[in-house]
Structures are given as C-alpha cells and as structure tokens.
C-alpha cells in the first residue's frame, strides 16, 4: 500500500532570463527512493539515481543544473519554459509517486515567486 505523499513548490513564477529551483519532497513513507525523474510535459529533463548520481538530458545541459538535493535548477528562463513540471519518485517497494509544479515565466520584472518549499 502506498502511504507516501509528495509536497512540491506548487505554482511558481519567475522572470525571463532568471532561474528557479524546482523542489519536491516525499514524506510519510519508509520506501527507499531509487531514482527521481524530472520531466516537462513528455520531455525528460534530468534523472537523479540514488546509486550513480545525476544525468541531465543533452538538450537541457546548458540550462539545467542538478540540485539542490533531489531538486532541479532551471536557468536562463524563457517564456517557452512556462508549463507543467513533474517530479517522479521511483521507490521500493511502494512504486511510483508523482508531484506536479506549474511554472509561469513572466516578461515583466514584477514576477512574484510562490513560496519556496525548503527541504529541512
């Protein structure tokens, strides 16, 4: 039975040209996290494997940085980066947990960032 829950940064906004941290946190389960996939719509951005480390998809290498933690940093944002992002936690023995974040990239300099989720 899957008892875990994923907390995310939720809906966030950022300025064009800036950067943002996408953060998820899996709680309420003792399942072992074997891998976290970060996806944008149907595109794989990055993988963090518990044993081997990070893999950043080649097409995002210049604009995506690992971390902090299991999170992902998006840099040099463009309006095309607006959309849904998913953190997919592969765990054993529970299975897969998915969290959703919506990022809006704004042209103006008055982008109000949603409350950042901090992993303790």
């Amino acid at each position: 039975m899957m008892t875990g829950t994923i907390e995310t940064t939720g809906n966030i906004s950022a300025e064009k040209g800036g950067s943002i941290i996408l953060q998820c946190h899996l709680s309420s389960t003792t399942a072992q996290v074997t891998q976290v996939n970060w996806e944008q719509q149907d595109q794989l951005l990055a993988i963090c494997n518990a044993d081997l480390g990070w893999h950043i998809s080649p097409s995002f290498k210049d604009r995506v940085a690992p971390g902090p933690g299991l999170g992902l940093t998006l840099q040099s944002l463009t309006v095309n980066d607006t959309g849904e992002y998913f953190c997919i936690y592969h765990t054993y023995p529970d299975g897969t947990y998915t969290g959703r974040i919506f990022l809006e990239v704004l042209e103006s300099s008055v982008a109000e960032h949603g409350a950042r989720f901090q992993i303790p």
Epitope: Q32, N49, D51, G53
Partner: antibody, heavy 117, light 107 residues
Framework: EVQLLESGGGLVQPGGSLRLSCAAS????????VSWVRQAPGKGLEWVGY????????YYADSVKGRFTISRDNSKNTLYLQMNSLRAEDTAVYYC??????????WGQGTLVTVSS | DIQMTQSPSSLSASVGDRVTITCRAS??????LNWYQQKPGKAPKLLIY???SLHTGVPSRFSGSGSGTDFTLTISSLQPEDFATYYC?????????FGQGTKVEIK
C-alpha cells in the same frame, strides 16, 4: 557476510559473445543496485553498467552501449552481463559490485575475459 | 563525462609515514567522492564514501576530506598492509568515473 561471485569468463574471438554471471549472498539482493566494473590488464578501473534493484532499469558506459546488456534474476540472487560483438579492447577482469549511496561497497573477485583471435 | 585526476601517480613511503593522495574533478561533484584500495590480483575495497565517511571495518588511520572539485585521502601512519593502489571515484554525474590510480610503494 556479503559475497559476490563472478563466473563465465574465458577466451572468445573478436565479434563473439559471452555471458557473465554474478551470484550474490549474505544480503537482500533485491534491495540493491548492482554494477559491473572492469579493469584491463595493468590499467585502471572502468564502470561498465548498472541495474536498478526493483524496476530493472539500466545504465551503460558509452563504450559498451548497444553491445552489452545487464539483467538480474532476484529470485536466484544473480546478476548477468551479456556481452556481444566483443572487441580486443573489452579484454579485462570484470567485477560485479554492489552499489550503495554512490559507492561500490562490496566487490566480487572478478572473472577474466580475453578477446583474441 | 567528469574527469578525475589523481596525484601523484605513484609515491614511495616508509611504514609510519603520513601519506596524502589528492583527487581533482573536472567540475563540481559536491561531496560525492569515494576512495578505494586495490592490491595486486585482488578486487578493490571501499575505504571512504561521500568524501569523508569511513566504510565499515576500515581502520581509522584512513581519512578523507574535500568538497567541490578537490579531495584528499590521508593515511595518518602507513602500515605494511597499506602498500597498494588507491583510486578515487565520483558518483555525482552519470557515468561514474575513476581516477587513474595512485600506487603506494615501499621506500
């Protein structure tokens, strides 16, 4: 006591195939990722590939991608490395190693693969 | 791929000496750095993981330090059984990569 025991090495001609096995004991095999690491004679260590404990997803070094396949049978506590289209540069001692927190914490004794005509 | 460079490639030391081996990564790897010892004809053994954590059963004369790109393995008082080749390995970016090794020989 954690133990890993490789087998299946030997002499094979270029272009040939070989399957290595790694029998695990002393720990819950299905809880751990496992990697293959090789060492050419007189050279350093090179990671070959990895398989996840439960879902079975795999990663490979570019040098073996498309030629080598890692699989596992958790019911038999055994890891496999299927090596096809072997080349002279694949000659090495092949080790299986348990992955833990980024390191390879336990290793087998190794099995020698020689690719030569 | 991340390149790992060890120095020196070999060194000669005496029993009781303090020995330091360094490992440099071509880009930051935070603290995802492991150290191994290998003796001729034997499999490598994990000594240190996550830059400074001692693996089970490893004597306390071995210690590791560093973060980012620069790391150090120190043997505080070299023992006869410590003559071997030492490898560093990063586990921050796939694929995992090893240094070329440092051979510690008897002076």
């Amino acid at each position: 006591e954690v133990q890993l025991l490789e087998s299946g090495g030997g002499l094979v001609q270029p272009g040939g195939s070989l399957r290595l096995s790694c029998a695990a004991s002393g720990f819950t095999f299905s809880n751990y990722g496992v990697s293959w690491v090789r060492q050419a004679p007189g050279k350093g260590l090179e990671w070959v590939g990895y398989i996840n404990p439960s879902r079975g997803y795999t990663y490979y070094a570019d040098s073996v991608k498309g030629r080598f396949t890692i699989s596992r049978d958790n019911s038999k506590n055994t890891l496999y490395l299927q090596m096809n289209s072997l080349r002279a540069e694949d000659t090495a001692v092949y080790y299986c190693a348990r992955s833990y927190g980024g390191g390879f914490d336990y290793w087998g004794q190794g099995t020698l693969v020689t690719v030569s005509s | 791929d991340i390149q790992m460079t060890q120095s020196p490639s070999s060194l000669s030391a005496s029993v009781g000496d303090r020995v330091t081996i360094t490992c440099r990564a071509s880009q930051t790897i935070e603290r995802r750095l492991n150290w191994y010892q290998q003796k001729p004809g034997k499999a490598p053994k994990l000594l240190i993981y996550d830059a400074s954590s001692l693996h089970t059963g490893v004597p306390s004369r071995f210690s590791g330090s560093g973060s980012g790109t620069d790391f150090t393995l120190t043997i505080s008082s070299l023992q006869p059984e410590d003559f071997a080749t030492y490898y560093c390995q990063q586990s921050y970016i796939i694929p995992p990569t090893f240094g070329q090794g440092t051979k510690v020989e008897i002076k």
